[in-house]
Interface confidence: medium
Amino acid sequence: KAMHVAQPAVVLANSRGTASFVCEYASPGKATEVRVTVLRQADSQVTEVCAATYMMGNELTFLDDSICTGTSSGNQVNLTIQGLRAMDTGLYICKVELMYPPPYYMGIGNGTQIYVIDPEPCPDSD
């Protein structure tokens, strides 16, 4: 079953290569287990950036080596992606799945265009 997902259209990563955006979903029921996946679309290729399953009211748990962190609040997930470089600029899509209890719902946002600008190297000082 389909569900609405919203996310901001554009986000600019900071000088340390960190970008944060919000992903909101319209929960048709009282989900207790939610899975959030961040997908990156660039040059018509879609790759999975990170994913986490969480119990409502608890923190999101990503894999130890994940570049993503996040928190949840109600029907909203605050996602942070770290270690981004200019080449990582692209459309980052939020996919939300309501895993439990049944029925299963899935929604995909329109994507957040994340722009990453590599910082200029500091000039050597004499």
Partner: nanobody, 127 residues
Framework: EVQLVESGGGLVQAGGSLRLSCLAS????????MGWFRQAPGKEREFVAA????????YYADSVKGRFTISRDNAKNTVYLQMNSLKPEDTAVYYC????????????????????WGQGTQVTVSS
């Protein structure tokens, strides 16, 4: 400074419909929850409906559930309140309000969580 301008109010017979609009100036409209409140003569201002920043979650006062529908068009910086099956007790000045924090998940009906308000539009329902 963001400005909110309501329109669409007027005089309508009981059972009729009206559609209120609230146009917001500024480029950050889509980042904020929006709400509608109303104040009847001699009464306190009360919550009517709210819509989340992304437009996917809506909230209603019990007194208007099933009759009123809130929606938004982020491309037009506008939030709407479609009011059907109007009753004389819906007579009030209707105010549009913008949430106080971008991408908030507070989802509150409390007036204190709204930072900016319009001037209001009068809705009169005659019996």
């Amino acid at each position: 400074e963001v400005q909110l301008v309501e329109s669409g109010g007027g005089l309508v017979q009981a059972g009729g419909s009206l559609r209120l609009s609230c146009l917001a100036s500024g480029r950050t409209f889509s980042s904020y929850d929006m709400g509608w409140f109303r104040q009847a003569p001699g009464k306190e201002r009360e919550f009517v409906a709210a819509i989340s920043w992304g437009g996917v979650n809506t909230y209603y006062a019990d007194s208007v559930k099933g009759r009123f529908t809130i929606s938004r068009d982020n491309a037009k910086n506008t939030v709407y309140l479609q009011m059907n099956s109007l009753k004389p007790e819906d007579t009030a000045v209707y105010y549009c309000a913008r949430g106080s924090a971008p991408y908030s998940s507070s989802r509150s009906s409390a007036q204190e969580t709204y930072a900016q308000w319009g001037q209001g539009t009068q809705v009169t329902v005659s019996s």
